[in-house]
């Protein structure tokens, strides 16, 4: 997860990213039919709020990473965990919250001078289908011009929100993560009541923009829990 800096205060001061189910990304109101499980095209509803299992960091929200919940626990069982803040211990970039990266086992702030187009470092990361171990390896990473020489525009492949231009966040879209617009007032958002409840979604919405929060739409208060529509509203 090689990324540069958070681009603006508008991104920095936002509430935690909220994954979401498929709907028209730019529409003011859209349906949210549920979550799509990797390996299948069938939807399920999203009203059970236990921590979801995951196989990789990309299956978690932008403020989460995928790991075993207990240090000595079953390494084969992984769930989405809250990202590590600055100065916390880490093993790989994805463990650190947006705007930070993992350096020498500690989450440190990404700064403008850190990424210069081509870097060399050691990354500890899990990949492939075997998630029972964390494989440490060194690699020289060439940051593609498409992705990193300029901030990613809408639709650009990204790894973290800091790869994206102002007003965009990095959100999962099927097997990729791409830059999507931060949600505006009135747009549908997805409220997760417990961390990790969106680990299996493969279509994530961005979070609500500055000064907005994801709340139940007023005329939906009487609806059942499973069908209540959340939209971005002024604080």
């Amino acid at each position: 997860t090689l990324n540069s800096v958070l681009n603006s205060n508008a991104i920095k001061n936002l509430p935690p990213p909220l994954g979401g189910a498929a709907g028209h990304p730019g529409s003011a109101v859209s349906a949210a039919p549920g979550i799509l499980y990797p390996g299948g095209n069938k939807y399920q509803t999203i009203d059970n709020y236990q921590p979801y299992p995951c196989a990789e960091d990309e299956e978690c929200g932008t403020d989460e990473y995928c790991a075993s919940p207990t240090r000595g626990g079953d390494a084969g069982v992984q769930i989405c965990l809250a990202c590590r803040k600055r100065r916390k211990r880490c093993m790989r970039h994805a463990m650190c919250c947006p705007g930070n990266y993992c350096k020498n086992g500690i989450c440190v702030s990404s700064d403008q001078n850190h990424f210069r187009g081509e870097i060399e470092e050691t990354i500890t990361e899990s990949f492939g289908n075997d998630h029972s171990t964390l494989d440490g390896y060194s690699r020289r990473t060439t940051l593609s011009s498409k992705m990193y020489h300029t901030k990613g525009q809408e639709g650009s492949v990204c790894l973290r929100s800091s790869d994206c231009a102002s007003g965009l966040c990095c959100a999962r879209h099927f097997w990729s993560k791409i830059c999507k617009p931060v949600l505006k007032e009135g747009q549908v958002c997805t409220k997760h009541r417990r961390k990790g409840s969106h680990g299996l979604e493969i279509f994530q919405r961005c979070y609500c923009g500055e000064g907005l929060s994801c709340r139940i739409q007023k005329d939906h208060h009487q609806a059942s829990n499973s069908s209540r529509l959340h939209t971005c509203q002024r604080h």
Epitope: P38, E56, N129, I178
Partner: antibody, heavy 117, light 107 residues
Amino acid sequence: EVQLLESGGGLVQPGGSLRLSCAASGFNFRDYAMSWVRQAPGKGLEWVSAISGRGSVYYADSVKGRFTISRDNSKNTLYLQMNSLRAEDTAVYYCARGGDWVAFDYWGQGTLVTVSS
Amino acid sequence: DIQMTQSPSSLSASVGDRVTITCRSSQSISNYLNWYQQKPGKAPKLLIYGASRLESGVPSRFSGSGSGTDFTLTISSLQPEDFATYYCQQSYSLPLTFGGGTKVEIK
């Protein structure tokens, strides 16, 4: 230069199996999702399967339970294991790299799979 | 599944002509629409992604427009090498689906 080179196609009987490979070069393979897309003779394009950089897999309903996509990031190679093959699986199979907007920005030259008795 | 409908299925044009191909999706797909060119015996080649963004190395005579359900690929001045089949593809929801193709032939 990005290159994708498929192999493993051929003639197989209905119910048989085949394993396709796609050797990738010119880019950091493990950072990209990869897909298989097929094209029956004289027909249009059909997405078959995809796999994320670290191994999460996705399938079209038409091949689910019969085809298995996988990748070996250490060998920069993508695979498609095709079992219980049917006549309607006859097609040129392309491997393709996932890019911006989840478009397929690079394609291999294709390998022909013929299922016939 | 989202159905992608291209029109026309084929057209005849001359070098220098302005050519327009349309693609319609069965439901809104925002800007998640890509265009490909395919020549006989060759692999498809990405032309336009995100409805209107020109892929690197693709001549500027190709352009894309549209959002929601209606999209257009335009070739401003047809060149001899442009005679091919063109496909649209949605990347908004799974399964990813392609249009049936538009064959551009020499008049």
